[in-house]
């Protein structure tokens, strides 16, 4: 089958109430079939490419475990399995200040060096 292109699928928006939790879905496709090398998953807030990171994890070659390196205020947790092309993120104890746009990003290293980030992101509405 032909190689897939890079793409990222996120919903336009997610709504939740302050104090509750929300899940920010993000799935992706990539052209590097059977890739099992080092991987980094990142979520940032505000704007793509330049906004501050709120979550980051890294998986070693051959591992499904994406070890959390950054979780802002300890409230962000990866639910999706990046090895299964899923970066869905859970945000706990929502505050009104969390009402912003979020962008998911995946980076491949090792034999393959490639990366992709959602351009439009998912808008989190906190009421």
């Amino acid at each position: 089958s032909p190689a897939q292109r890079w793409s990222m699928q996120v919903p336009p928006e997610v709504s939740a109430e302050a104090g509750d939790a929300a899940v920010l879905p993000c799935t992706f496709t990539h052209p590097h079939r059977h890739y099992d090398g080092p991987l980094t998953a990142i979520w940032r807030a505000g704007e793509p490419y330049a906004g501050p990171q709120v979550f980051r994890c890294a998986a070693a070659r051959g591992s499904e475990l994406c070890q959390t390196a950054l979780s802002l205020h300890g409230r962000f947790r990866l639910l999706g399995n990046p090895r299964r092309n899923d970066l869905s993120l859970r945000v706990e104890r929502l505050a009104l200040a969390d009402d912003r746009r979020y962008f998911c990003r995946v980076e491949f290293a090792g034999d393959v060096h490639d990366r992709y980030e959602s351009r439009h992101g998912v808008r989190l509405h906190v009421t």
Epitope: T27, R33, H34, Y35, D36, A60, R61, G62, S63, E64, L65, Q67, L78, L79, G80, N81, R83, R84, N85, D86, S88
Partner: antibody, heavy 121, light 107 residues
Framework: QVQLVQSGAEVKKPGASVKVSCKAS????????VSWIRQAPGQGLEWIGV????????GYNEKFKARATITVDTSTSTAYMELSSLRSEDTAVYYC??????????????WGQGTLVTVSS | DIVMTQSPDSLAVSLGERATINCKAS??????VDWYQQKPGQPPKLLIY???NRYTGVPDRFSGSGSGTDFTLTISSLQAEDVAVYYC?????????FGQGTKVEIK
């Protein structure tokens, strides 16, 4: 050939802790994730957590995060799972399982024989 | 957590007949479902990974299908040694979760 050999059955009192071991052989231990999965008598399977022996990094099912600790000793190719504050509902067979991979697909390809942990006063 | 619901809970099939086990995920898990077989007193054994891929050494009477939320394990011609409990498991989300199991017996 790949083998995972677990420690023997344990009987513990409520409130105590138990540490189960899983000795791996037949493959390069640091390269593959090892998960712990339990099965209560006559019940289904429940994933507890995972460790990547190469880095020592761990991930847990939130249900067990406060009570389970997964570690490894790479010098002996052994993974450990310690569960604290035991209660009767923790009575189960505990399995370690290797998360093998093939062409970018991951799966539990080799399992330990299981360790029965009985919690009883 | 993702809930994996298997049906039926138990199944009695004549030797040589087809056995079909269904597994429904509470949300989309892509094709990221494996099937395991467990016999009494033994650990589970991998049969099918990534919904459709038969693991090394597994007889070709076992096949898997499905994606999204609905998955099926089929034993095309039941043999005596297939009497066991079968579990589906999703690995798209953490924590990994299993179905409650389906017991297959001979009618």
């Amino acid at each position: 050939q790949v083998q995972l050999v677990q420690s023997g059955a344990e009987v513990k009192k409520p409130g105590a802790s138990v540490k189960v071991s899983c000795k791996a052989s037949g493959y390069t231990f640091p390269r593959y994730d090892v998960s712990w999965i339990r099965q209560a008598p006559g019940q289904g399977l429940e994933w507890i957590g995972v460790i990547h022996p190469g880095s020592g990094g761990t991930g847990y099912n939130e249900k067990f995060k406060a009570r389970a600790t997964i570690t490894v000793d790479t010098s002996t190719s052994t993974a450990y799972m310690e569960l604290s504050s035991l209660r009767s509902e923790d009575t189960a067979v505990y399995y370690c399982a290797r998360r093998g991979l093939n062409s970018g697909y991951w799966f539990f390809d080799f399992w330990g024989q299981g360790t029965l942990v009985t919690v009883s006063s | 957590d993702i809930v994996m619901t298997q049906s039926p809970d138990s199944l009695a099939v004549s030797l040589g007949e087809r056995a079909t086990i269904n597994c429904k995920a509470s949300q989309n898990v892509g094709s990221n479902v494996d099937w395991y077989q467990q016999k009494p007193g033994q650990p589970p054994k991998l049969l099918i990974y990534e919904s459709t891929n038969r693991y090394t050494g597994v007889p070709d009477r076992f096949s898997g299908s499905g994606s999204g939320t609905d998955f099926t394990l089929t034993i095309s011609s039941l043999q005596a040694e297939d009497v066991a409990v079968y579990y589906c498991m999703q690995s798209n989300f953490f924590p990994f979760t299993f179905g409650q199991g389906t017991k297959v017996e001979i009618k």
